[in-house]
């Protein structure tokens, strides 16, 4: 089996963590988040070739069926395997509060 | 906000559970699974338009950034939210065994 972390398409082409710099306006949060007004968003981007970072047996099945029926079954997709928490400072009825969000920033990626 | 389960692209076009009939040969399992010889594979297929079955806030972010930077950030992707277990009868060194696999069949779907 091919090394599950070695990208056959060339460096950086396969499913991996990317960082995208975004403003609150970009994210659609400008009206409810006070700070920070800019965020480094980590997300999972890239192709999922056969055997690359397969999350589970479902991903294996999906890849096999995609090769047989590419018009019916899509290839596996690069998604977060886990998340990092993030703090946002928000306006509340009583003033200002620090809020933790657990599902905002991808921590690592796999193919499903 | 649009109903998260109403597909704006038309019935059946958005992320949902599909069943694909497959043989063990299709799945690449013919050499190690004895039974069943054919499987109804449930998997998640379909588009993920804005606000449709968003798994979490990461999916919201991804969609907003995709609209801004479609060449850099892909749209959210339709993947299993949970799985159904499945029993396979396999060959072993000592004979035959029943094995349960927890991550083979998608149970329901969402967009990440």
């Amino acid at each position: 089996a091919r090394n599950g972390d070695r990208c056959p398409l060339g460096p950086g082409r396969c499913c991996r963590l990317h960082t995208v710099h975004a403003s609150l306006e970009d994210l659609g949060w400008a009206d409810w988040v006070l700070s920070p007004r800019e965020v480094q968003v980590t997300m999972c981007i890239g192709a999922c070739p056969s055997q690359f970072r397969e999350a589970n047996m479902h991903a294996q099945i999906k890849m096999n069926l995609h090769r047989l029926k590419p018009d019916t079954v899509p290839a596996p997709c690069c998604v977060p395997a886990s998340y990092n928490p993030m703090v946002l400072i928000q306006k509340t009825d009583t003033g200002v509060s620090l809020q933790t969000y657990d599902d905002l920033l991808a921590k690592d990626c796999h193919c499903v | 906000a649009r109903n998260g389960d109403r597909c704006p692209l038309g019935p059946g076009r958005c992320c949902r559970l599909h069943t694909v009939h497959a043989s063990l040969e299709d799945l690449g399992w013919a050499d190690w699974v004895l039974s069943p010889r054919e499987v109804q594979v449930t998997m998640c297929i379909g588009a993920c338009p804005s606000q449709f079955r968003e798994a979490n806030m990461h999916a919201q972010i991804k969609m907003n950034l995709h609209r801004l930077k479609p060449d850099t950030v892909p749209a959210p992707c339709c993947v299993p939210a949970s799985y159904n277990p499945m029993v396979l009868i396999q060959k072993t060194d000592t004979g035959v065994s029943l094995q349960t696999y927890d991550d083979l069949l998608a149970k329901d779907c969402h967009c990440v």
Partner: antibody, heavy 119, light 107 residues
Framework: QVQLVQSGAEVKKPGASVKVSCKAS????????INWVRQAPGQGLEWMGW????????NYAQKLQGRVTMTTDTSTSTAYMELRSLRSDDTAVYYC????????????WGQGTMVTVSS | DIQMTQSPSSVSASVGDRVTITCRAS??????LAWYQQKPGKAPKLLIY???SLQSGVPSRFSGSGSGTDFTLTISSLQPEDFATYYC?????????FGGGTKVEIK
């Protein structure tokens, strides 16, 4: 690089007010909040409050409510902390510091301003 | 308010020693704990944020661990420039609060 530069040392009489400034450079001032933290001689760090340069919203330490006012001037990228009705136990080094960021980090600090309250 | 209790309040150590400082929060603060180093007459310097993430430019001999209520700062091999006072700080909720400090002195 990101920098916070504070105003110079002050000597004040009890009952007076002091206003300390903190000029930011090297980043977009409205993107982050500013904290004010003080440290009495030989003591630990005490958080005084926070202001967002974006909207002017604040959160003050309960102990200082009514005596402290934090403001910002976005045209000059400067934050201000005014403390009124000064007492001798307000004698401290006053720091401004940027944050919290998305990982709750308060990452860049000013050099500090010594405020002495003495009759 | 969340109380932050640091221990020990001071520690005497030699160059090359492994030094461990602990910080306990009075309630859970997820991973929102930072560690600062302060030298006399200077502003605090951020070493670790989010409990275990090393701030850019900080030597790798510094490491942080923990989540919830119990946290640790470790200096794996103490260097002459590490003699200073160290503070923990929570930013899980307002008001932001600091530990009382740990002074690392030369033995």
């Amino acid at each position: 690089q990101v920098q916070l530069v504070q105003s110079g040392a002050e000597v004040k009489k009890p009952g007076a007010s002091v206003k300390v400034s903190c000029k930011a450079s090297g980043y977009t001032f409205t993107s982050y909040g500013i904290n004010w933290v003080r440290q009495a001689p030989g003591q630990g760090l005490e958080w005084m409050g926070w202001i967002t340069a974006y909207s002017g919203d604040t959160n003050y330490a309960q102990k200082l409510q009514g005596r402290v006012t934090m403001t910002t001037d976005t045209s000059t990228s400067t934050a201000y902390m005014e403390l009124r009705s000064l007492r001798s136990d307000d004698t401290a080094v006053y720091y401004c510091a940027r944050g919290p960021g998305q990982y709750a980090d308060v990452d860049v600090w000013g050099q500090g301003t010594m405020v002495t309250v003495s009759s | 308010d969340i109380q932050m209790t640091q221990s020990p309040s001071s520690v005497s150590a030699s160059v090359g020693d492994r030094v461990t400082i602990t910080c306990r929060a009075s309630q859970g603060i997820s991973s929102w704990l930072a560690w600062y180093q302060q030298k006399p007459g200077k502003a605090p310097k951020l070493l670790i944020y989010a409990a275990s993430s090393l701030q850019s430019g900080v030597p790798s001999r510094f490491s942080g661990s923990g989540s919830g209520t119990d946290f640790t700062l470790t200096i794996s091999s103490l260097q002459p420039e590490d003699f200073a006072t160290y503070y923990c700080q929570q930013a899980n909720s307002f008001p932001i609060t600091f530990g009382g400090g740990t002074k690392v002195e030369i033995k």
